[in-house]
Interface confidence: medium
C-alpha cells in the first residue's frame, strides 16, 4: 500500500533569479484531486492553498509581489489528496539579484576565438564578496561558481562551438543574494560546419561546478515533466 504520493514539481516564474522589488510566482504542480498544497520556506509553513474544485486543478501559484533578501532562500511544496500526503518537492532556491553593486566580466584571450582554444572568463567586483557566479544564457541556464577576494576566474578549457553564447556574472553576498548582473559578454567560437551541426545546444561541464536550471515556460512544463525535476535542484548544494 502506497504511503505517500509522488512529489510535486516546484518552479519559479518568470525565473528563480528575481531582481529586488520585482514580483515572482512560485508554482507547485501536484495531482488533480489535491485538496491542499503547502509551501514551506526554510523549514516553516509559508503559505497554504486549497484549490477549488480540486478535481480540475493540478497546479497552484504563490505570488510574491515584492522580492527582497528576506524572501530569498529555499522553498519546497507538498500536497494532499484525501488523507494522503505527497513527498516534498525538490528544493527551489529563490535568489534575489540587483543587490548593491555591478561586477565586470571579461574574457581571455577575447570574445572571438577558434574552436580548441582555451578560454577563461574573469568576474571582478570590488566590494565585499568572495563568491562569484557565471551564467550562460539560453534554454538551459548553466551556473558556475568561482571564488576570489575581488575577482574569480572561470576557465572553460578548450572551447567548442557549443560554448558560443552570451555570458553574465554576478557577485554573491550569500547563497541567495546576488549583485546586479554584469554587462553581457558574447563569446563567438568559430569552427568547421560539421562540428557546429553536431554540437549540443549547451556544453557539458564538470558535475561538481555546474548546475542546470531550466527556464520556466508553461509549454515546456507540459512537454516534459522529467526535465522539471531539475528546476529546483539546489544551486549551491
Amino acid at each position: 500500500q502506497q504511503q505517500t504520493l509522488p512529489k510535486p514539481f516546484i518552479w519559479a516564474e518568470p525565473h528563480f533569479m528575481v531582481p529586488k522589488e520585482k514580483q515572482v510566482t512560485i508554482c507547485c504542480q501536484g495531482n488533480y484531486g489535491a485538496v491542499e498544497y503547502q509551501l514551506h520556506f526554510e523549514g516553516s509553513l509559508f503559505a497554504v492553498d486549497r484549490p477549488k474544485p480540486p478535481e480540475r486543478i493540478n497546479k497552484v501559484q504563490f505570488y510574491i509581489p515584492d522580492m527582497n533578501s528576506r524572501m530569498a532562500g529555499q522553498y519546497s511544496c507538498i500536497y494532499r489528496v484525501g488523507e494522503l500526503w505527497s513527498e516534498p518537492s525538490n528544493l527551489l532556491d529563490l535568489v534575489v539579484t540587483e543587490m548593491y553593486d555591478t561586477p565586470t566580466l571579461s574574457v581571455h584571450p577575447g570574445p572571438e576565438v577558434i574552436s580548441g582554444e582555451k578560454v577563461t572568463f574573469y568576474c571582478r567586483l570590488d566590494t565585499a564578496t568572495s563568491m562569484f557566479l557565471l551564467l550562460k544564457e539560453g534554454r538551459s541556464s548553466h551556473v558556475q561558481r568561482g571564488y576570489g577576494k575581488v575577482q574569480a576566474e572561470f576557465p572553460l578549457g578548450p572551447v567548442t562551438t557549443a560554448h558560443r553564447g552570451t555570458y553574465r556574472c554576478f557577485g554573491s553576498y550569500n547563497n541567495h543574494a546576488w549583485s546586479f548582473p554584469s554587462e553581457p559578454v558574447k563569446l563567438l567560437v568559430t569552427g568547421d560546419i560539421e562540428n557546429t551541426s553536431l554540437a549540443p545546444e549547451d556544453p557539458t561541464f564538470p558535475a561538481d561546478t555546474w548546475g542546470t536550471y531550466l527556464l520556466t515556460t508553461e509549454t515546456g512544463l507540459q512537454k516534459d515533466h522529467a526535465l522539471w525535476d531539475h528546476t529546483a535542484q539546489n544551486l549551491l548544494r
Epitope: E36, L45, V48, R70
Partner: nanobody, 120 residues
Framework: DVQLVESGGGLVQPGGSLRLSCAIS????????MSWVRQAPGKGPERVSW????????SYADSVKGRFTISRDNARNMLYLQMNSLKSEDTARYYC?????????????WGQGTQVTVSS
C-alpha cells in the same frame, strides 16, 4: 481561510501561571511545526518555544527553559503554551505562528496575539 486565534493571556502576579491556547483552522495542522513568539514593547520578536508536527521535538528559549511547556492537540487543531513561575520580563504580546525562523508577519501565518502582563 487560514486562521490562528490565541487566547488565555491576562494580568498575573510574579510567580503565577497562565496557559495560552491557539485554535488553528484552514490547513492540515498535524504536519506543520509551530512556534510561540513574543514581542515586548520596544523590543524585537523572540521565539519562546517551538514544536514539530507530531510533538516528538520541542525547543525553548534559554529565558523560559524549565518554566514554559509547549504542547499540541492535533485532533483538536490546538497549540498550547503552559507558563509557570512567571516573571515581569515575560510581559509581552504572545503570538502563535507557523514561522520558525523569520519572525516577521509577512512570513507564514500569525494569530493576532494575546497580551500577557506580569505585575504585582
Amino acid at each position: 481561510d487560514v486562521q490562528l486565534v490565541e487566547s488565555g493571556g491576562g494580568l498575573v502576579q510574579p510567580g503565577g501561571s497562565l496557559r495560552l491556547s491557539c485554535a488553528i483552522s484552514g490547513f492540515t495542522f498535524s504536519i506543520v511545526s509551530m512556534s510561540w513568539v513574543r514581542q515586548a514593547p520596544g523590543k524585537g520578536p523572540e521565539r519562546v518555544s517551538w514544536i514539530n508536527g507530531d510533538s516528538s521535538n520541542t525547543s525553548y528559549a534559554d529565558s523560559v527553559k524549565g518554566r514554559f511547556t509547549i504542547s499540541r492537540d492535533n485532533a483538536r487543531n490546538m497549540l498550547y503554551l503552559q507558563m509557570n513561575s512567571l516573571k515581569s520580563e515575560d510581559t509581552a504580546r504572545y503570538y502563535c505562528t507557523t514561522q520558525n525562523s523569520h519572525y516577521d508577519i509577512r512570513f507564514g501565518y500569525w494569530g493576532q496575539g494575546t497580551q500577557v502582563t506580569v505585575s504585582s
